[in-house]
């Protein structure tokens, strides 16, 4: 539908509160360094303008596109050149190039201070004093640190954030009530951000077809009773929603997501029996619930796939005349039968099937050529199964922290050029696959583990893309979206790496480590472990374990000492010397 004024259309559809929140998110995701007050001012100006367009759609500038309106507004920021450098050059461009330019300057790792959580009483006072500003600040701080956060979902997080403060600031023990809720929101928020970052990377780096294939597989697992045509419609709509959000079109994205939720709930009988509860919820909760809904039961007596995809005389004709439809149907049929497979595995199987048909269909006897295509799937299925089995055994044996350490060593040896903070962050997240997925029964392990690993490895890819240092990382990240994990798994020790020069400063610790939380202390130790491996890539597990055990004992000893700083200084020197000797440095 063409509207005379797009801004008026979206304002009316979304309502003032959501409109303002989404514009704030959009601006904060583009101009990540701008102060909160500046963004609020810009949002208010846009909102006032939108209201004039609602009153009269023919008013001046109301016919302009949202990109033009928002881009013009962002380009009024006085400090653009000194704060953002070359991003200011975007303002010399015309739409749509200007928006593309802004998108290219989004920073996945902005140089922003860590968010420190104030005391509960301080937070509750701020919440009561000015609830609106408090919640806007939440949106702003999350959006600028996560420039690809799924905007309509961030509205849902903000709603839960508000609910937590509304409830807990009245509670007898505010901290006991609030802190677990904030921890949960933080962890869920990080996970949500990372999942959305993979969707955007999929769309931006591998194109719409890659995203659609992912969506066909996932929705077919989730809605196995739905017809292919229904799944295809949902995939088309979902692709539009995510394309918009990843492209910075947050108002359109939120509006279209609401429409999609409405459609799903109006047609739940032909989609899934699991949607009933979701569809009784208010909009934001409803959309979130649908996105997370459990897989429906598979229809009984599904016929063998071989009939349509191997035995039929029309296989090659169907493939050649409409690959998207035929391979889409293959993926749909395979995925709905296999909720026990990861989406990336299903996509690998579909690619193998496609490659086989492309090779065989022009042959003298196509059927003879592709008759055994399903046999080619066996090793592809067994590889992640075996990998997950081995790693879950290792996780159960070591526990999360030591499992993370094993992965830290493994990945530092594979790609030692990658920065230490990135290796620590990524390996810690890879290690969380254990507690997240190994508790599941066999049938749920692979979709949990491998699809989670895809999300984490995408973090490595986007961080590495900002400052590329390893050809091996670039290769694994860019060659194939679905083969990223097998590509990284297959990497051996990088024999070309020249060990890092030893720097005692890297291994000098102070009494401040004693006041850190357990998590922060782990990160310090894991940082030291990565640095050790970078100095001595050929160190054995046993050597590294001995040094790390000594290090843990050293920290524990000095944190109990009366004069902690002296202990760290003196014992630290001894530890460095002993470690050098143990590792032959």
């Amino acid at each position: 539908d063409a509207h005379k004024s797009e801004v008026a259309h979206r304002f009316k559809d979304l309502g003032e509160e959501n409109f303002k929140a989404l514009v704030l998110i959009a601006f904060a995701q583009y101009l990540q360094q701008c102060p909160f007050e500046d963004h609020v001012k810009l949002v208010n100006e846009v909102t006032e303008f939108a209201k004039t367009c609602v009153a009269d759609e023919s008013a001046e500038n109301c016919d302009k596109s949202l990109h033009t309106l928002f881009g013009d507004k962002l380009c009024t920021v006085a400090t653009l050149r000194e704060t953002y450098g070359e991003m200011a050059d975007c303002c010399a461009k015309q739409e749509p190039e200007r928006n593309e330019c802004f998108l290219q300057h989004k920073d996945d790792n902005p140089n922003l201070p860590r968010l420190v959580r104030p005391e509960v009483d301080v937070m509750c006072t701020a919440f009561h004093d000015n609830e609106e500003t408090f919640l806007k600040k939440y949106l702003y701080e999350i959006a600028r640190r996560h420039p690809y956060f799924y905007a309509p979902e961030l509205l849902f997080f903000a709603k839960r954030y508000k609910a937590a403060f509304t409830e807990c600031c009245q509670a007898a023990d505010k901290a006991a009530c609030l802190l677990p809720k904030l921890d949960e929101l933080r962890d869920e928020g990080k996970a949500s951000s990372a999942k959305q970052r993979l969707k955007c990377a999929s769309l931006q780096k591998f194109g719409e077809r890659a995203f659609k294939a992912w969506a066909v597989a996932r929705l077919s697992q989730r809605f196995p009773k739905a017809e292919f045509a229904e799944v295809s419609k949902l995939v088309t709509d979902l692709t539009k929603v995510h394309t918009e959000c990843c492209h910075g079109d947050l108002l359109e994205c939120a509006d279209d997501r609401a429409d999609l939720a409405k459609y799903i709930c109006e047609n739940q009988d032909s989609i899934s029996s699991k949607l009933k509860e979701c569809c009784e919820k208010p909009l934001l909760e409803k959309s979130h619930c649908i996105a997370e809904v459990e897989n429906d039961e598979m229809p009984a007596d599904l016929p063998s796939l071989a009939a349509d995809f191997v035995e039929s005389k029309d296989v090659c004709k169907n493939y050649a005349e409409a690959k998207d439809v035929f391979l889409g149907m293959f993926l749909y049929e395979y995925a709905r039968r296999h909720p026990d497979y990861s989406v990336v595995l299903l996509l690998r199987l579909a690619k193998t099937y496609e490659t086989t048909l492309e090779k065989c269909c022009a042959a003298a006897d196509p059927h003879e050529c592709y008759a055994k295509v399903f046999d080619e799937f066996k090793p592809l299925v067994e590889e992640p199964q075996n990998l997950i089995k081995q790693n879950c055994e290792l996780f159960e044996q070591l526990g999360e922290y030591k499992f993370q350490n094993a992965l830290l060593v493994r990945y530092t040896k594979k790609v030692p050029q990658v920065s230490t903070p990135t290796l620590v962050e990524v390996s810690r997240n890879l290690g969380k696959v254990g507690s997240k997925c190994c508790k599941h029964p066999e049938a749920k392990r692979m979709p949990c583990a491998e699809d989670y690993l895809s999300v984490v490895l995408n973090q490595l890819c986007v961080l590495h893309e900002k400052t590329p240092v390893s050809d091996r990382v670039t290769k694994c990240c860019t060659e194939s979206l679905v083969n990223r994990r097998p590509c990284f798994s297959a990497l051996e020790v990088d024999e070309t790496y020249v060990p890092k020069e030893f720097n005692a400063e890297t291994f000098t610790f102070h009494a401040d480590i004693c006041t850190l939380s357990e998590k922060e202390r782990q990160i310090k130790k894991q940082t030291a472990l990565v640095e050790l491996v970078k100095h001595k890539p050929k160190a054995t597990k046993e050597q590294l374990k001995a040094v790390m055990d000594d290090f843990a004992a050293f920290v524990e000893k000095c944190c109990k000492a009366d004069d902690k700083e002296t202990c760290f200084a003196e014992e630290g020197k001894k530890l460095v010397a002993a470690s050098q000797a143990a590792l032959g440095l």
């Epitope: 004709k317 005349e321 409409a322 690959k323 492309e358 090779k359 003298a364 196509p366």
Partner: antibody, heavy 121, light 110 residues
Framework: EVQLLESGGGLVQPGGSLRLSCAVS????????INWVRQAPGKGLEWIGI???????FYATWAKGRFTISRDNSKNTVYLQMNSLRAEDTAVYYC???????????????WGQGTLVTVSS | DIQMTQSPSSVSASVGDRVTITCQSS???????LSWYQQKPGKAPKLLIY???KLTSGVPSRFSGSGSGTDFTLTISSLQPEDFATYYC???????????FGGGTKVEIK
């Protein structure tokens, strides 16, 4: 040495028909897919259609109905039957092999030298 | 409707120059089904590159292809006298019936 050799071109009146041949030597045609591609004087390349080793054919949307591709593996020859010819069908017609290992990709690794078809009254 | 747009339509260059030819497709080609051909006057086309970036055997390494989806590039790193010719991109799509060539780029001597 593998060779593809087109023949059968010439002058034909509008509305007329013509059958082009593509004789293949140096390889067993029965294992390969063959395409027909044309090029109007001073213009670019235009894909007409393909015949797979199995005999299955596909055509460009514009060519469906008027053009028919067939093969005779015993003669190691592929044919292009053209009906209801028009002035705009005037072109050099090439046969070309699809690169082995592909079926629908536009990778044509062996070409004939082409035969000129002129449609004019 | 399938569109395969090649640019520029002609380029004048000297021996040793770096030449870049682009090919834009709408919609995106299927699975990097993108080829590049070289054609000299009165001769049949010759396949240079397939799958967007793979060189066919015997093609000099000064030729390279890149791109994916909708945007592709053929680069000749250092033009040689035998490279003056017309170059075509070819695209394959979801339906084989949509197989299409670009309009061509003539590389001429400056």
């Amino acid at each position: 040495e593998v060779q593809l050799l087109e023949s059968g071109g010439g002058l034909v009146q509008p509305g007329g028909s013509l059958r082009l041949s593509c004789a293949v030597s140096g390889i067993d045609l029965s294992n390969y897919a063959i395409n027909w591609v044309r090029q109007a004087p001073g213009k670019g390349l235009e894909w007409i259609g393909i015949i797979w080793a199995s005999g299955t054919t596909f055509y460009a949307t514009w060519a469906k109905g008027r053009f028919t591709i067939s093969r005779d593996n015993s003669k190691n020859t592929v044919y292009l039957q053209m009906n209801s010819l028009r002035a705009e069908d005037t072109a050099v017609y090439y046969c070309a092999r699809t690169y082995p290992g592909y079926s629908t990709a536009p990778y044509f690794d062996l070409w004939g030298q082409g035969t000129l078809v002129t449609v004019s009254s | 409707d399938i569109q395969m747009t090649q640019s520029p339509s002609s380029v004048s260059a000297s021996v040793g120059d770096r030449v870049t030819i682009t090919c834009q497709s709408s919609p995106s080609v299927w699975s990097n089904f993108l080829s590049w051909y070289q054609q000299k006057p009165g001769k049949a086309p010759k396949l240079l590159i397939y799958e967007a970036s793979k060189l066919t055997s015997g093609v000099p390494s000064r030729f390279s292809g890149s791109g994916s989806g909708t945007d592709f590039t053929l680069t000749i790193s250092s033009l040689q006298p035998e490279d003056f010719a017309t170059y075509y991109c070819g695209g394959g799509y979801s339906s084989i019936s949509d197989t299409t060539f670009g309009g061509g780029t003539k590389v001429e001597i400056k």
